[in-house]
Interface confidence: low
């Protein structure tokens, strides 16, 4: 990825266009890879990632992955090409302007993933309000 302070630009050998033929510029995303998180049982969370990167490729979108197991909670923020699977899952919501978390089946952990295509959209991850954790083992308000 390109450092955050670098201006958006397009190399001639990397020009990508959207469906309307307009030039598609690389996107800005939060990119902290995997970090421990205190995001638990909330309707939405900020990533608390201080690194904003320009995605390497114009077609890449922002991705966030939230995982909870018996030991810890992590939040992963990256850029990724939606044509390629991530953690063995297709990025179905890559065109969404918001990062709406969807639960994926992973043995031994609770696993949510979202993708989105507006700048820094993976900074605010949104969980469905209807979702209830299957193991309500602690009161959010105490351990936020």
């Amino acid at each position: 990825t390109i450092p955050p302070h670098v201006q958006k630009s397009v190399n001639n050998d990397m020009i990508v266009t959207d469906n309307n033929g307009a030039v598609k510029f690389p996107q800005l995303c939060k990119f902290c890879d995997v970090r421990f998180s205190t995001c638990d049982n909330q309707k939405s969370c900020m990533s608390n990632c201080s690194i904003t990167s320009i995605c390497e490729k114009p077609q890449e979108v922002c991705v966030a992955v939230w995982r909870k197991n018996d030991e810890n909670i992590t939040l992963e923020t990256v850029c990724h090409d939606p044509k390629l699977p991530y953690h063995d899952f297709i990025l179905e919501d890559a065109a969404s302007p918001k990062c709406i978390m969807k639960e994926k089946k992973k043995p031994g952990e609770t696993f949510f993933m979202c993708s989105c295509s507006s700048d820094e959209c993976n900074d605010n991850i949104i969980f469905s309000e209807e979702y209830n954790t299957s193991n309500p083992d602690l009161l959010l308000v105490i351990f936020q």
């Epitope: 309000e129 209830n132 083992d137 602690l138 009161l139 308000v141």
Partner: antibody, heavy 121, light 107 residues
Framework: QVQLVESGGGLVQPGGSLRLSCAVS????????MSWVRQAPGKGLEWVSA????????ANTDSVKGRFSISRDNSKNTLYLQMNSLRAEDTAVYFC??????????????WGQGTLVTVSS | DIQMTQSPSSLSASVGDRVTITCRAS??????LNWYQQKPGKAPKLLIY???SLQSGVPSRFSGSGSGTDFTLTISSLQPEDFATYYC?????????FGQGTKVEIK
């Protein structure tokens, strides 16, 4: 049915110590965070301490930090509150309460009947 | 800490009356707001969680509404057993904080 029964309250002098217990039955104690909430005579409710299901995480309100310690014994289905360096302002009925957390759904329910702690010389 | 302010502090009403209690948070708490009922010498009882969800076993005359900073508990038709003190509580951030309570008395 679900029951939370507090004990250990009583009269203690300022600077003294007490240990409260909360015996739990009717639900899978080890799966839930637990809290202590107190109520001074004629006053409102104040959250005091909480502990995670596994007992590895605790939190306290500022006014009791360094003086009160919450713990639990999941094999005995019992919650504890060790209270040291007690002050007159700690005088209250102390309730234990089960914590429930899910997305958008975080509350104390049910509660025990409470035990009265009086700090006075 | 988030401050919770209830109004009124007390009110007098008759059986059958519609009663409304309001709760204001010092900052936005989304829908992380619970309501409890407490009778003298008894433990608090959960009525409403997540601002508007009725706890199992609570009569449907109790309802809650609001989001952000302003919330309301409504008793559509006051019954004799409803005379009690009502508390709101935010569960948005640590520490969880309660309103000062609203005492509903018989007129």
């Amino acid at each position: 049915q679900v029951q939370l029964v507090e004990s250990g309250g009583g009269l203690v002098q300022p600077g003294g110590s007490l240990r409260l217990s909360c015996a739990v039955s009717g639900f899978e104690f080890r799966r839930y965070a637990m809290s202590w909430v107190r109520q001074a005579p004629g006053k409102g409710l104040e959250w005091v301490s909480a502990i995670s299901a596994g007992g590895d995480r605790t939190a306290n309100t500022d006014s009791v930090k360094g003086r009160f310690s919450i713990s639990r014994d999941n094999s005995k289905n019992t919650l504890y509150l060790q209270m040291n360096s007690l002050r007159a302002e700690d005088t209250a009925v102390y309730f234990c309460a089960k914590g429930t957390a899910a997305r958008g759904k975080n509350y104390f329910d049910p509660w025990g009947q409470g035990t009265l702690v009086t700090v006075s010389s | 800490d988030i401050q919770m302010t209830q109004s009124p502090s007390s009110l007098s009403a008759s059986v059958g009356d519609r009663v409304t209690i309001t709760c204001r948070a010092s900052q936005s708490i989304s829908s992380y707001l619970n309501w409890y009922q407490q009778k003298p010498g008894k433990a608090p009882k959960l009525l409403i969680y997540a601002a508007s969800s009725l706890q199992s076993g609570v009569p449907s005359r109790f309802s809650g509404s609001g989001s952000g900073t302003d919330f309301t508990l409504t008793i559509s038709s006051l019954q004799p057993e409803d005379f009690a003190t009502y508390y709101c509580q935010q569960s948005y951030s640590t520490p969880p904080t309660f309103g000062q309570g609203t005492k509903v008395e018989i007129k």
